[in-house]
């Protein structure tokens, strides 16, 4: 990813071609989360419909245990909506109180999991603090972006908190990826 | 779209082969709503610029009557963006005076029209509470997306409050789709 | 820009084909930014890390002083999140006072710059009122969509208020751009 | 706690097949990637290839390639090694590892000798 | 392959030294990994990413550098420091590690 790779301008047919419907492509959407044990400070990983309604996984690309595996290197297009939804956040109890108000935050993480590097690498992080005042509230974090990723890596969804995330709708709360 | 589709892995040119300027592609902005009669329950669509400014549609997709046509069956990418603005909303007026708190929301939901199906499919939703405590604000939901979709299906943007969509400039709302 | 092409529907191969890594491609991550003088009502341009990390630019797709340059004219698509953070908006402080009560706002541009047009062009703009009554706020801005460039157009990100851009990681903050 | 443990016959006869399995224990084997390094007498470390469990992806060093399979069976918790045509040169002890998104671990390794 | 020179191959240190071995990659890495290897035991991961400390590994032990050139250092040597120390790259295919640097007492 260091540098610059200049094409020749003059060469208009590259090699290898490909039909982009051959191209490896995911769609998850939401289910009820199941809840599990996480370790502590990490993120609990959100888990996915791979094949029913709108989701769906083609070419390779598989949904195995929480995680979209890559099945060729190459630069992919990466995306998540999570819904959020909750009681009048603790922040505007605390300030009612008179207590030190430091806000909640609703917080959603797109991850990669790769063999060379013994860390997650955090590609896209959408955060918001909540100070909300109405006794419910709800909203989406969207995220999106480019990266080059590996074959064999592999890509979740953390959430900061699973008992906030909407389930209830398919269109509400999704993930997924497809190689450009 | 419910099972994986494995390629062979020894292939490298697939077929059919297509330049990519050729796909269908739109980018839609907005401007201002008039006021219809919609459906109780169903929440109004927006119409669109498309040929103005920033929009167009290329490659046989088309736009009418505040649907995008897709011409071709395929993996299409789905956007939108809607900016909302409006005056104090009712939830903290009504908060003010000690009656139930519910808040008031916003809504973004891009659906999927196919005339062999009865019911339109809503394949992106992006809902906020609002409890805002000053007298202006303004916000815009995002929403994108990936989708198989089918020659002939249509696509809308609907809204929950029309009024409430700020239409005066096309780089606040704005709606799109391209061939993968 | 302005109406729609045809292509035949019969013809399957079209030409130029060209392979899909060979795409100019940019993924721009924050860096910590350094206070520069700008124009009375022009909101300051963002400048990126372009090759640390996750960020990088390829296929003739170049990074420099501010801008991405668009190597060669197609359709592209173009993103960019901007994470804010800031204390208790003004908004707040003067409502309490009495006084009127304007909100403040956060606000993503994402411009074009096209050397044969003297005005910049808004492409996409992310435009958020903060009324937040929590001392400590923090939130995203997300903007995509696909536009028409030509080689040589030139493509920023102008904020409202520089010193409220979270600055601290690269998956918080970021701009890319890539040939469809 | 999390535990590899590489076993396999300790002897191999020249020109025939290496076979050493791995079990884990104390981990979701699916959430990694496991790998084979080897070590010969009074050499360094040599990594072999990896296998990326929940898919099935390998990669395999190039001096090896024609020679290493890895395989894994999720059910039984198990990563596989195959070495074929084996010649004194791969007597080593060979251990398997764990990398991607948590700390690396190593198994304690398992001795084989080649030789007739 | 990405070739990994470490130097020196052995070294011998009085305990409270510092003591810094080098890593040179013949082309440039983004990452390095430091790994500590007693006599008949698996090798251990001590430093990821070039300079990040592993969870339970000693503050006196550090990694830094950058592209081909990375440097290991033990801050002040302890007895139990006694062993061989690797360099390994994980970027290329295949991985590859140095050849080892012996840390003794003198």
């Known amino acids: 990813l260091k540098g610059q790779e200049f094409a020749p301008s003059h060469q208009q047919v590259y090699a290898p071609l490909r039909a982009d419907g051959d191209k490896p492509r995911a769609h998850l959407t939401v289910v009820r989360q199941t809840p599990t044990q996480h370790l502590k400070n990490q993120f609990p990983a959100l888990h996915w419909e791979h094949e029913l309604g709108l989701a769906f996984t083609k070419n390779r690309m598989n949904y195995t245990n929480k995680f979209l595996l890559i099945p060729e290197s190459g630069d992919y297009f990466v995306y998540s909506q999570v819904t959020f939804r909750g009681m009048t956040s603790e922040c505007s109890e605390i300030r009612q109180a008179g207590r030190p108000n430091k806000p909640d935050s609703i917080t959603v993480v797109i991850t990669k999991v790769t063999d060379s590097y013994p860390e997650p690498t955090q590609l896209l992080m959408g955060t918001k603090s909540v100070c909300e005042v109405g006794s419910n509230w709800f909203q989406p974090i969207y995220l999106g972006a480019m990266f080059s990723l590996q074959e064999g890596d592999k890509l979740m969804v953390n959430v900061s908190d699973i008992s906030l995330v909407d389930y209830t709708k398919e269109d509400k709360t999704f993930f997924g990826a497809f190689l450009l | 779209l419910k099972g994986q589709e494995f390629a062979p892995s020894h292939q490298q040119v697939y077929a059919p082969l297509r330049a990519d300027g050729d796909k269908p592609r739109a980018h839609l902005t907005v401007v201002r709503q008039t006021p219809t009669q919609h459906l109780k329950n169903q929440f109004p669509a927006l119409h669109w610029e498309h040929e103005l400014g920033l929009a167009f549609t290329k490659n046989r997709m088309n736009y009418t009557n505040k649907f995008l046509l897709i011409p071709e069956s395929g993996d299409y990418f789905v956007y939108s963006q809607v900016t909302f603005r409006g005056m104090t909303s009712e939830c903290s007026e009504i908060r003010q005076a000690g009656r139930p708190n519910k808040p008031d929301s916003i809504t973004v939901v891009i659906t999927k029209v196919t005339d062999s199906y009865p019911e339109p499919t809503q394949l992106l939703m992006g809902t906020k509470s609002v409890c805002e405590v000053g007298s202006n604000w303004f916000q815009p939901i995002y929403l994108g997306a990936m989708f198989s979709l089918q020659e002939g299906d249509k696509l809308m943007v609907n809204v929950s409050d029309i009024s409430l969509v700020d239409y005066t400039k096309e780089d606040k709302t704005f709606f799109g789709a391209f061939l993968l | 820009l302005k109406g729609q092409e045809f292509a035949p529907s019969h013809q399957q191969v079209y030409a130029p084909l060209r392979a899909d890594g060979d795409k100019p491609r940019a993924h721009l991550t924050v860096v910590r930014q350094t206070p520069t003088q700008h124009l009375k009502n022009q909101f300051p341009a963002l400048h990126w890390e372009h090759e640390l990390g996750l960020a990088f630019t390829k296929n003739r797709m170049n990074y420099t002083n501010k801008f991405l340059l668009i190597p060669e004219s197609g359709d592209y698509f173009v993103y960019s999140q901007v994470t804010f953070r800031g204390m208790t908006s003004e908004c707040s402080e003067i409502r309490q006072a009495g006084r009127p009560n304007k909100p403040d706002s956060i606000t993503v541009v994402i411009t074009k710059v096209t050397d044969s047009y003297p005005e910049p062009t808004q492409l996409l703009m992310g435009t958020k009122s903060v009324c937040e009554v929590g001392s400590n706020w923090f939130q995203p801005i997300y903007l995509g969509a696909m536009f028409s460039l030509q080689e040589g157009d030139k493509l920023m990100v102008n904020v409202s208020d520089i010193s409220l851009v979270d600055y601290t990681k690269e998956d918080k903050t970021f701009f890319g751009a890539f040939l469809l | 706690q999390v535990q590899l443990q590489e076993s396999g016959p300790g002897l191999v006869r020249p020109s025939q097949t290496l076979s050493l399995t791995c079990t884990v224990s104390?981990?979701?084997?699916?959430?990694?990637?496991m790998h084979w390094v080897r070590q010969r007498p009074g050499r360094g470390l040599e990594w072999m290839g990896r296998?990326?469990?929940?898919?099935?992806?390998?990669k395999y060093n190039p001096s090896l390639k024609s020679r290493v399979t890895i395989t894994r069976d999720t059910s039984k918790n198990q990563v596989s090694l195959r070495l074929s045509s084996v010649t004194a040169a791969d007597t080593a002890v060979y251990y398997c590892?764990?990398?991607?998104?948590?700390?690396?671990?190593w198994g304690q390794g398992s001795l084989v000798t080649v030789s007739s | 392959d990405i070739q990994m020179t470490q130097s020196p191959s052995s070294l011998s240190a009085s305990v409270g030294d510092r003591v810094t071995i080098t890593c040179r990659a013949s082309?440039?890495?983004?990452?390095m990994y430091w790994y500590q290897q007693k006599p008949g035991k698996a090798p251990k991961l001590l430093i990821y990413?070039?300079?990040n400390l592993a969870s339970g590994v000693p503050s006196r032990f550090s990694g830094s550098g950058s592209g081909t050139d990375f440097t290991f250092t033990i801050s002040s040597l302890q007895p139990e420091d006694i062993a061989t120390y690797y360099c390994?790259?994980?970027?290329?295919?295949?991985?590859?590690f140095g050849q080892g640097t012996k840390v003794e007492i003198k």
């Open positions: 590892v764990r990398s991607g998104g948590l700390p690396d671990v």
């Open positions: 104390g981990f979701d084997m699916q959430s990694t990637y």
């Open positions: 296998i990326e469990p929940a898919g099935g992806h390998t």
């Open positions: 082309q440039g890495v983004e990452y």
């Open positions: 990413g070039a300079s």
């Open positions: 390994q790259q994980w970027e290329g295919n295949p991985r590859t």
